[in-house]
């Protein structure tokens, strides 16, 4: 499942400060890419990582569920 | 210590396009950092024209400088590049880059344009 | 885009006073995502106060930052001459990313 993908990696990242960032990078937002959503981050570099990470693999697996739902239906 | 050298003052024509660098040293060009370009008008605020994300490539841009402004990277040289073009006075400014995405700024081109 | 209106345009104090400048903003900023910038004449900014509330590395802790929603706020708690600069806030949580018309602090 998409949670438990994003706590395996979460799990990497031991500052819980980062783990934050990895969470946030994986709420939905259909408005913007995950660049320009990292973009706004002023924690610096790790902070980005790890958020962009999280960001690219929840976007990536939303947008495989929804296509098994299109071909389902 | 991280540091954004900016290249030096340009006094250009009308019409014509420039080129300014910003070196950055003290951290990973390459890493998750995005290098941001701010416009300062004398006297005046600042306003952010777009950033480049050096790892990838990506670039954003405020809607008003799209056409004005072309930002690319050097990575190997760890520079990032703003071109501005057709250049009208509205165009004199300060141009700054920062990175970090806002801790750091580069010390800022004056761009000038004059017939 | 988010416009933000800083207030007031120009200020004057004199050393160990109180001083408050306040950023509104057009529509709801995140916390996470507003900050302020020092600017003396004829230098580059400088990160001042992040995510609202959070001191620059290097900021003196006479300054504070607060606020939510469409209302912010920089506070000098006893202001000394080496204040005297222009203050600007940024939104980023939205694009563009946009300035405040800053205010500019001189000291008596």
């Known amino acids: 499942t998409l949670q438990k993908k994003i706590e395996e990696i979460a799990a990497k990242y031991k500052h819980s400060v980062v783990k934050k960032c990895c969470y946030d990078g994986a709420c939905v937002n259909n408005d913007e890419t995950c660049e320009q959503r990292a973009a706004r981050i002023s924690l610096g570099p790790r902070c980005i990582k790890a958020f962009t990470e999280c960001c690219v693999v929840a976007s990536q697996l939303r947008a495989n569920i929804s296509h098994k739902d299109m071909q389902l239906g | 210590e991280v540091r954004l050298q900016q290249s030096g003052p340009e006094l250009v024509k009308p019409g014509a396009s420039v080129r300014i660098s910003c070196k950055a040293s003290?951290?990973?060009?390459?890493?998750?950092?995005?290098m941001n370009w701010v416009k300062q008008s004398h006297g005046k605020s600042l306003e952010w024209i777009g950033y480049?994300?050096?790892?990838?490539?990506?670039?954003h841009y405020n809607q008003r400088f799209k056409g004005k402004a072309t930002l690319t990277v050097d990575k190997s040289s760890s520079t990032a590049y703003m071109e501005l073009r057709s250049l009208t006075s509205e165009d004199s400014a300060v141009y700054y880059c920062a990175s970090g995405p806002f801790a750091y700024w580069g010390q800022g081109t004056l761009v000038t344009v004059s017939a | 885009e988010i416009v933000l209106t800083q207030s007031p345009a120009i200020m004057s104090a004199s050393p160990g006073e109180k001083v408050t400048m306040t950023c509104r903003a057009s529509s709801s900023v995140s916390s996470s995502y507003l900050h302020w910038y020092q600017q003396k004449s004829g230098a580059s900014p400088k990160l001042w106060i992040y995510?609202?509330?959070n001191l620059a590395s290097g900021v003196p802790a006479r300054f504070s930052g607060s606020g939510s929603g469409t209302s912010y706020s920089l506070t000098i708690s006893s202001v000394e001459a080496e204040d005297a600069a222009t203050y600007y806030c940024q939104q980023y949580s939205g694009y563009p990313l946009t300035f405040g018309g800053g205010t500019k602090l001189e000291i008596k």
């Open positions: 995510s609202t509330s």
């Open positions: 480049i994300f050096p790892k990838t490539g990506g670039t």
């Open positions: 003290g951290y990973t060009f390459n890493d998750y950092y995005y």
